[in-house]
């Protein structure tokens, strides 16, 4: 009899058994039947081991030994062996940012009988692999909950009957799609031409971020550094060089491994300043022995659109004005507290209309009319008194709380013409004649 | 699998035109940056011009810029390059890529543009 | 621009030796800095974006390091499939430049 058969190897189409007699008789015979699906074949030796050649990918093989001696034979015995299904190859993978479906081929004649063991590994993370075995005769697979952006090796083997797989497996490395960024806020800086963006950092790995920023003709590109979605930490970075009061059309786009999500956009306005001081001063001319008019171009509005203009008078020297004299009144004049004071306010807004960037407006003001514009007194001017006129324009206006009325210089965004040539007022006519 | 196919190549005289074209499968052409590289006969690599993703934002080296159109269509899937008042030194293998982050990541197999009288 | 400065221009190496090829840029350029190589007649592949990443399916013989103006590219155990010119290229500010190329041939 024999017994012990063993399978020492089994590749695609080899296999090498090995058995045991009872006795050590040299003069035995080994007859073996081969037999598969695909037909038998008989064969014969003289030892007790023998390799069997020119076998079929993935196949169950039923082997038989008889012994024969003398021409007398003994017990047979048996064993069933599948050989190895060949290596899958083709290996196609489809991404999204948390799955890939992996298809493969595999091109053995008993491939309708093969389900496919998958290990997908997370590149520097080999002790925590995935395993997804297929149904027989499925060359497809989804493999979920994925990590965005990251790098995988997925290892497909072919495995058939009990677990017999193939030798070696297909091998694969895929990336996933990096996550979009969720959204990004614009913050404005205070007088500054810039827009600080902040995000916080899309879900699972990236190795950067394209910023674009586009505003008419003008645009600019530029990378990011990566970040790190572990701890939520807000991330911000501030893009200059921009103009002021502009709207800026902004687009982030995450990068990893080489691939790139769908762009993050946002639209975003730039803050304002105080408006760039004009090159002219403003034209005064008497109108009577207690009034003048004023004329003025209206401020360039490069620096955020002009929601007011102060005319401003003085009967001091022409320094360049400070924001401090907008808290004067013609109240504070006529009681000598100041030699410079507000006499009228323009707030541009109420004319309905936007003024665009390259629109210059003309302003033509009565000064001495007696009109009161919200805190400030249009008074009547002095005769044979000495005028010369100035233009605050501003951009962000804002009033004293407590002082109802007045402007809060050191809050509003203003610049200031310079001051007029001077313009001598004539004599009360009331005065000659009496 | 990214795949990128120039095509449009050819011989032209200088002053003449061409409009070379670069078809994309395999990803979301309309997510990439997009750049034309070129590589004169037996030379060295030059980026030629450069589109965004977000608004097609173009960028152009100073040799081409004036003369050289970037354009896509994401529709299609497809990225141009319109040469105009092309010169002898523009004779080179065109090839589109893909550009993240400043890296020529995945290339076409190339087209030749021979300028030429 | 920002120039990229190769060296060597040429060098040739046995079966199994560790070869490097050194990349300067002109200005810093943190570390916007990718490898390609380029067989005859082929075009340019990918092997290290960002100074050090290796791109999917480039062996783990090849290595990059470097930032700032100093980069460089370390090929471990030769290979014949190794031969090729390598070219390094600056991706910080356009225009991008590349090398002048580094022929790499099996002795």
């Known amino acids: 009899a024999v017994f012990d058969i063993h399978v020492v190897y089994v590749t695609t189409t080899e296999m090498w058994l090995d058995w045991k007699s009872p006795d050590g008789a040299s003069e035995y015979v080994y007859h073996l039947v081969i037999e598969s699906k695909h037909g038998s074949n008989h064969t014969s030796t003289y030892d007790k081991a023998i390799t069997l050649q020119g076998l079929i990918p993935g196949t169950l093989y039923n082997i038989t030994i008889s012994p024969e001696v003398d021409h007398v034979w003994g017990d047979p015995n048996s064993t069933a062996q599948y050989t190895r299904p060949s290596n899958v190859s083709n290996i196609d993978v489809s991404t999204n940012t948390t799955a890939a479906t992996l298809s493969w081929q595999n091109f053995d004649d008993a491939s309708p009988t093969y389900s496919y063991c998958l290990l997908i590994e997370k590149a520097g993370n080999s002790s925590n692999a995935t395993q997804v075995v297929t149904d027989i005769g499925i060359t497809d697979a989804t493999v979920t909950e994925l990590i965005p952006g990251s790098s995988y090796t997925v290892e497909i083997f072919a495995q058939v009957g009990d677990g017999i797989k193939s030798l070696e497996p297909g091998r694969k490395s895929f990336c996933t799609d990096p996550a979009s960024m969720a959204s990004f806020d614009c913050e404005v800086v205070p007088k500054e031409p810039a827009l600080v963006l902040k995000w916080t950092c899309p879900p699972g790995a990236n190795a950067g971020f394209e910023l674009e920023v586009s505003s008419g003709a003008w645009n600019n590109a530029t990378h990011l550094e990566s970040c790190s979605s572990e701890n939520g930490t807000e991330y911000r970075t501030e893009v200059t060089y921009l103009n002021f009061s502009t709207s800026y059309n902004i687009s982030i786009t995450t990068v990893s491994c080489g691939k790139m999500a769908a762009p993050t956009r946002n639209t975003c306005t730039t803050g304002i300043t105080d408006p760039p001081p004009p090159d002219g001063s403003p034209n005064i001319t008497s109108v009577s022995h207690n009034s003048v008019k004023v004329k003025f171009s209206g401020f360039e509005a490069s620096h955020g659109p002009i929601k007011a203009y102060a005319v401003i008078l003085t009967t001091g020297e022409a320094g360049h004005p400070s924001a401090d004299v907008l808290k004067y009144t013609y109240e504070d004049f006529k009681k000598g507290a100041s030699d410079t004071y507000v006499t009228y306010l323009i707030r541009t807004e109420e004319k309905g209309r936007s003024q665009s960037l390259s629109e210059v407006l003309k302003y033509e003001i009565d000064v001495g009319n007696e009109s009161t514009t919200l805190g400030y007194y249009n008074g009547k001017l002095e005769p044979l008194g000495s005028y010369r006129a100035c233009v605050a324009g501003f951009t962000n206006i804002t009033f004293h709380p407590q002082n109802k009325g007045l402007i809060d210089g050191a809050e509003s965004y203003v610049s200031f013409s310079r001051y007029s040539d001077a313009v001598s007022l004539p004599q009360d006519p009331g005065v000659i004649c009496g | 699998e990214v795949k990128l196919v120039e095509s449009g190549g050819g011989l032209v005289q200088p002053g003449g035109s061409l409009k070379l074209s670069c078809a994309a499968s395999?990803?979301?052409?309309?997510?990439?940056?997009m750049a034309w590289v070129r590589q004169a006969p037996t030379k060295g690599l030059e980026w030629v011009a450069y589109?965004?993703?977000?608004?097609?934002?173009?960028y152009y080296r100073d040799s081409v810029k004036g003369r050289f159109t970037i354009s896509r269509d994401n529709a299609k899937s497809t990225l141009y390059l319109q040469m105009d008042s092309l010169r002898s030194e523009d004779t080179a293998t065109y090839y589109c890529?893909?550009?993240?982050?400043?890296?020529?990541?995945?290339w076409g197999q190339g087209t030749l543009v021979t300028v030429s009288s | 621009d920002i120039q990229m400065t190769q060296t060597p221009h040429s060098l040739s190496a046995s079966l199994g030796e560790t070869v490097s090829i050194e990349c300067l840029a002109s200005?810093?350029?943190?570390?916007?800095l990718a490898w390609y190589q380029q067989k005859p007649g082929k075009s340019p592949q990918l092997l290290i974006s960002?100074?050090?990443p290796l791109h999917d399916g480039v062996p783990s013989r090849f290595s990059g390091s470097g930032s700032g103006t100093q980069f460089s590219l370390k090929i471990r155990n030769m290979q014949p499939e190794d031969e090729g010119v390598y070219y390094c290229?600056?991706?910080?500010?356009?225009?991008?430049?590349f090398g002048a190329g580094t022929k790499l041939e099996l002795k």
């Open positions: 200005e810093g350029i943190s570390n916007y």
């Open positions: 290229q600056q991706g910080y500010k356009f225009p991008y430049t």
């Open positions: 890529s893909t550009v993240p982050l400043g890296a020529f990541v995945s």
């Open positions: 395999g990803f979301t052409f309309s997510n990439y940056y």
């Open positions: 589109i965004t993703n977000g608004f097609g934002s173009t």
């Open positions: 960002h100074a050090n």
